[in-house]
C-alpha cells in the first residue's frame, strides 16, 4: 500500500467578503486511521480551524459526509468570510493515538479575501477660504482587499492632478486603507462646485464609489459695496442706499454710521440669489438733511461671516 498523501489541489482561492470559502482536501489512503484537522498558518502559532475529532466550529462545515465508509474527502466550507480570514490553510492528517499525532500535511491553500472599500469620505478645511486661495481636501476609504486600488479627484467633472495618495499599510495585511489629499484653487464661481473623490477597486465590478464635498461649505466670497445717493424723496430727506453684492455665505450684518456714529444695524434677510450662488442685498437710509448744518459722512459698514468689517463711505452735501 502506498503511503497516504494529503492533496490540496488549489494553491490559492479568492473569495468575496461575506461569501463562503471552500477549501479542498483529499487523502489518498484510509491508512493510518486518525482524524483530519485544518489549520491557518504553520508552526507553533498556527490557528486551529477545524478538528474532525473534537471541538465546536460554527462557521465550518464538511463538504462531504465524512462519517461515510471509505470517505477520503475532507474539504471544508467556511461561512461569512471576512478579511481577517485571509491566510494559508493546511489540511493535516493525524494518526490515531493517545494523543493523536500529526502524520502528514497538505501543501496549503492561500485564501485571499476580496473586500469592498468603504464609501469614500471627503472632508474639507476647517475654516472657509476666499477665492484665489488653495485649499486641501482629504478622502479616506477603508477595509478593502486586495491592496490594488485607484483613486481619482474631480472638480465639477474635471479631473484634478494636484493630489497625493497613500495606501496603508505598506506590507501584507488582511485589509487596507487609502488616504488622499487634493489641492483645489477656489474661484468666485465655486459656490455651486463639487469636489469628488472616486475609488475604483476589483470588488466594485467597474462601478466606482464616490465621495463628494460641496465647495459651498468651504468658500467665502466677500461682498463688494456701493453706496449711492438717491434723489430727494421728500422735502429735507435724502435716500442713501448701500448695495452689497456677490457675497457668500449669507451671514451678514450691516451698520450705518452718520459721521462715525451708529445710526442703524441690521442683518441681511431678504437677499436675492445670483446664478453663481452668491447673494445680493440692499440697505437704505433716510437722512433728514434739515437736522444737519454741516456736510454728513455716511458709512455703510459690513461684517460678513464673522470677518473683519469692510466699509464704504459717502459724503452727503448739505446745501445752505
Amino acid at each position: 500500500e502506498e503511503e497516504l498523501q494529503v492533496i490540496q489541489p488549489d494553491k490559492s482561492v479568492s473569495v468575496a467578503a461575506g461569501e463562503s470559502a471552500i477549501l479542498l482536501c483529499t487523502v489518498t489512503s484510509l491508512i493510518p486511521v486518525g482524524p483530519i484537522q485544518w489549520f491557518r498558518g504553520a508552526g507553533p502559532a498556527r490557528e486551529l480551524i477545524y478538528n474532525q475529532k473534537e471541538g465546536h466550529f460554527p462557521r465550518v462545515t464538511t463538504v462531504s459526509e465524512s462519517t461515510k465508509r471509505e470517505n477520503m474527502d475532507f474539504s471544508i466550507s467556511i461561512s461569512n468570510i471576512t478579511p481577517a480570514d485571509a491566510g494559508t490553510y493546511y489540511c493535516v492528517k493525524f494518526r490515531k493515538g493517545s494523543p493523536d499525532t500529526e502524520f502528514k500535511s497538505g501543501a496549503g491553500t492561500e485564501l485571499s479575501v476580496r473586500a469592498k472599500p468603504s464609501a469614500p469620505v471627503v472632508s474639507g478645511p476647517a475654516a472657509r477660504a476666499t477665492p484665489q486661495h488653495t485649499v486641501s481636501f482629504t478622502c479616506e476609504s477603508h477595509g478593502f482587499s486586495p491592496r490594488d486600488i485607484t483613486l481619482k479627484w474631480f472638480k465639477n467633472g474635471n479631473e484634478l492632478s494636484d493630489f497625493q495618495t497613500n495606501v496603508d499599510p505598506v506590507g501584507e495585511s488582511v485589509s487596507y486603507s487609502i488616504h488622499s489629499t487634493a489641492k483645489v484653487v477656489l474661484t468666485r464661481e465655486d459656490v455651486h462646485s463639487q469636489v469628488i473623490c472616486e475609488v475604483a477597486h476589483v470588488t466594485l465590478q467597474g462601478d466606482p464609489l464616490r465621495g463628494t464635498a460641496n465647495l459651498s461649505e468651504t468658500i467665502r466670497v466677500p461682498p463688494t459695496l456701493e453706496v449711492t445717493q438717491q434723489p430727494v424723496r421728500a422735502e429735507n430727506q435724502v435716500n442713501v442706499t448701500c448695495q452689497v453684492r456677490k457675497f457668500y455665505p449669507q451671514r451678514l450684518q450691516l451698520t450705518w454710521l452718520e459721521n462715525g456714529n451708529v445710526s442703524r444695524t441690521e442683518t441681511a434677510s431678504t437677499v436675492t440669489e445670483n446664478k453663481d450662488g452668491t447673494y445680493n442685498w440692499m440697505s437704505w437710509l433716510l437722512v433728514n438733511v434739515s437736522a444737519h448744518r454741516d456736510d454728513v459722512k455716511l458709512t455703510c459698514q459690513v461684517e460678513h461671516d464673522g470677518q473683519p468689517a469692510v466699509s464704504k463711505s459717502h459724503d452727503l452735501k448739505v446745501s445752505a
Epitope: 500500500e1 484510509l30 491508512i31 486511521v33 486518525g34 482524524p35 478538528n51 474532525q52 475529532k53 473534537e54 471541538g55 459526509e65 465524512s66 462519517t67 461515510k68 465508509r69 471509505e70 470517505n71 490515531k96
Partner: antibody, heavy 119, light 110 residues
Framework: QVQLVQSGAEVKKPGASVKVSCKAS????????INWVRQAPGQGLEWIAM????????HYNQIFKDRATLTTDTSTSTAYMELRSLRSDDTAVYYC????????????WGRGTLVTVSS | DIVLTQSPDSLAVSLGERATINCRAS??????????IFWYQQKPGQPPKLLIY???NRDSGVPDRFSGSGSGTDFTLTISSLQAEDVAVYYC????????FGQGTKLEIK
Amino acid sequence: QVQLVQSGAEVKKPGASVKVSCKASGYTFTNYWINWVRQAPGQGLEWIAMIDPSDSETHYNQIFKDRATLTTDTSTSTAYMELRSLRSDDTAVYYCAMDYGSLYAMDYWGRGTLVTVSS
Amino acid sequence: DIVLTQSPDSLAVSLGERATINCRASQSVRSSGYNWIFWYQQKPGQPPKLLIYLASNRDSGVPDRFSGSGSGTDFTLTISSLQAEDVAVYYCQHSRELPTFGQGTKLEIK
C-alpha cells in the same frame, strides 16, 4: 481522550424490553459511528448494529433487525440500544464501540452492560 | 453473508515462541484496494481491544510483536514472541459488508 460510559446492569423478565445507554465524551459525537456488539457468557462476539449519529443512518444484523432499535441523543452525546421481546438467550454483556476510521471497525469500547434475562 | 472461520479454536504456545492464528473468509473481503479484516484481543473481564486494522496495520500503542498478513480470503495474526500478557481470546472481524466476527481463538501459555 475518548470515553464510552455505559449504563448499569439490568435484570429483565422474558418478553420484556431493555434499553442500554452509552454516553460518549472526548470527541465530537456526530462525527463517528457507534456499533453495538454483544457477548453471551463464555461465548464469542456478535455484532448487533451500528448508527451514524450525524443523520441516524443505521445498519442492522438481520438477526436483530426486528427486535433491536438504535437511537442517539446528540444534545447529550448518548447512544441507545433497545432490545425487545427478550429471551433467556439474550443474556449477555452488551458493548458499545466507536468506529474512529469509518471502516466499520471498533476502535474504542465501552466497558459493557450485563443484561440478564430470567424468569 | 460472509462467514469468518478461525483456526485453531485454541492454541498453547511457549513464552518467547511464535503464535499464529488464522482467519478464513467464505468469500473475498478485498475491496477498493483494501483487505477489510480486523483483529481484536480480549482479556477476561475486559472489552475487546483493536490490534490490527485493514489486515496488516497495527493500531496505535500495539506492540510490534503483533503483525497481520494475508489477502482475499486467508488472513493470519502472528505474535512473534509470546509474552505472558498476550494470554487472551483473539477475534477476527470483517467489514467487506456489514461486520461479522470469527468464533474466536483462545491463546494460552504452554
